[in-house]
């Protein structure tokens, strides 16, 4: 039975040209995280594999940095980066957990972060 839950940074906004950290946290399960995939709609941004480390998709190498932790940092944001992002936790033996983050990239300097939480 899958007992875990994923907390995310929720709906967030950031300025064009700036950077943002996408972060998820899996709790309430003793399952072992084997891999975390970061996806934007149908595009794979990056993989963090527990055994094999990071892989950044070649088309995002210039604008994506691994971490902190299992999170992902998006840099040099453009308005086209607005949209849904998913953290997909592959775990053993539970299976797959998915978290959703909505990022809005704003032209102006009035961007504010949405709900925040501390990752332990």
């Amino acid at each position: 039975m899958m007992t875990g839950t994923i907390e995310t940074t929720g709906n967030i906004s950031a300025e064009k040209g700036g950077s943002i950290i996408l972060q998820c946290h899996l709790s309430s399960t003793t399952a072992q995280v084997t891999q975390v995939n970061w996806e934007q709609q149908d595009q794979l941004l990056a993989i963090c594999n527990a055994d094999l480390g990071w892989h950044i998709s070649p088309s995002f190498k210039d604008r994506v940095a691994p971490g902190p932790g299992l999170g992902l940092t998006l840099q040099s944001l453009t308005v086209n980066d607005t949209g849904e992002y998913f953290c997909i936790y592959h775990t053993y033996p539970d299976g797959t957990y998915t978290g959703r983050i909505f990022l809005e990239v704003l032209e102006s300097s009035v961007a504010e972060h949405g709900a925040r939480f501390q990752i332990p």
């Epitope: 084997t34 527990a50 055994d51 094999l52 480390g53 971490g67 053993y92």
Partner: antibody, heavy 118, light 107 residues
């Protein structure tokens, strides 16, 4: 304390196989990956592959794929690395090494010298 | 695979000297770099990980710095027990690769 103890030195003929063991103690064997790294005489270090002792996932360096087999025995907290079709350039010290944290190696076995000679 | 280029391949120094070893990966590895010390007939010993974090029990005369494609290991005041070979290793994404080593010898 954390310790990895490897099997003794081996001398093999070209074309033969060798199986090196690595017994872990001082921690929960299934909690941390076990890597195998080799070092030819006077040379640098070369990563061979990794096994996750918990669910058995194995990943090999492409250079060794097809010639190396990694296994583990949870009941004895022992990992094994078998290398087939040995050639003289496989002469090296073979180390097992834990990545206790993330993908660097902070606990090493003492090494096993494998000599391939006709 | 990421290639790790270490320099120099060897150096001679005296006790008390400041020693610097560099490591240049072939591509950006962010801060995913480790340094090891190896003495003849012994297994490597972890000194530094995440480019600058000192491993447990490592003396403070050792320090690591750098990110991206340029990293440095510094020994601020060389001690007799520091004469050894030093290797860098990236721990970004497999396959993990090592530099060719830097042998620190007594002048």
């Amino acid at each position: 304390q954390l310790q990895l103890v490897q099997s003794g030195a081996e001398v093999k003929k070209p074309g033969a196989s060798v199986k090196v063991s690595c017994k872990a103690s001082g921690y929960s064997f299934t909690d941390y990956n076990m890597n195998w790294v080799r070092q030819a005489p006077g040379q640098s270090l070369e990563w061979i592959g990794v096994i996750n002792p918990n669910h058995g996932t194995i990943s090999y360096n492409q250079k060794f794929k097809g010639r190396v087999t990694m296994t583990r025995d949870q009941s004895t907290s022992t990992a094994y690395m078998e290398l087939n079709s040995l050639r003289s350039e496989d002469t090296a010290v073979y180390y097992c090494a834990n990545n206790w944290d993330v993908w660097y190696f902070d606990v090493w076995g003492q090494g096993t010298l494998v000599t391939v000679s006709s | 695979d990421i290639q790790m280029t270490q320099s120099p391949s060897s150096l001679s120094a005296s006790v008390g000297d400041r020693v610097t070893i560099t490591c240049r990966p072939s591509e950006n590895i962010y801060s995913y770099l480790a340094w090891y010390q190896q003495k003849p007939g012994k297994a490597p010993k972890l000194l530094v990980y995440n480019a600058k974090a000192l491993a447990e029990g490592v003396p403070s005369r050792f320090s690591g710095s750098g990110s991206g494609t340029d990293f440095t290991l510094t020994i601020s005041s060389l001690q007799p027990e520091d004469f050894a070979t030093y290797y860098c290793q990236h721990h970004f994404g497999a396959p993990w690769t090592f530099g060719q080593g830097t042998k620190v010898e007594i002048k």
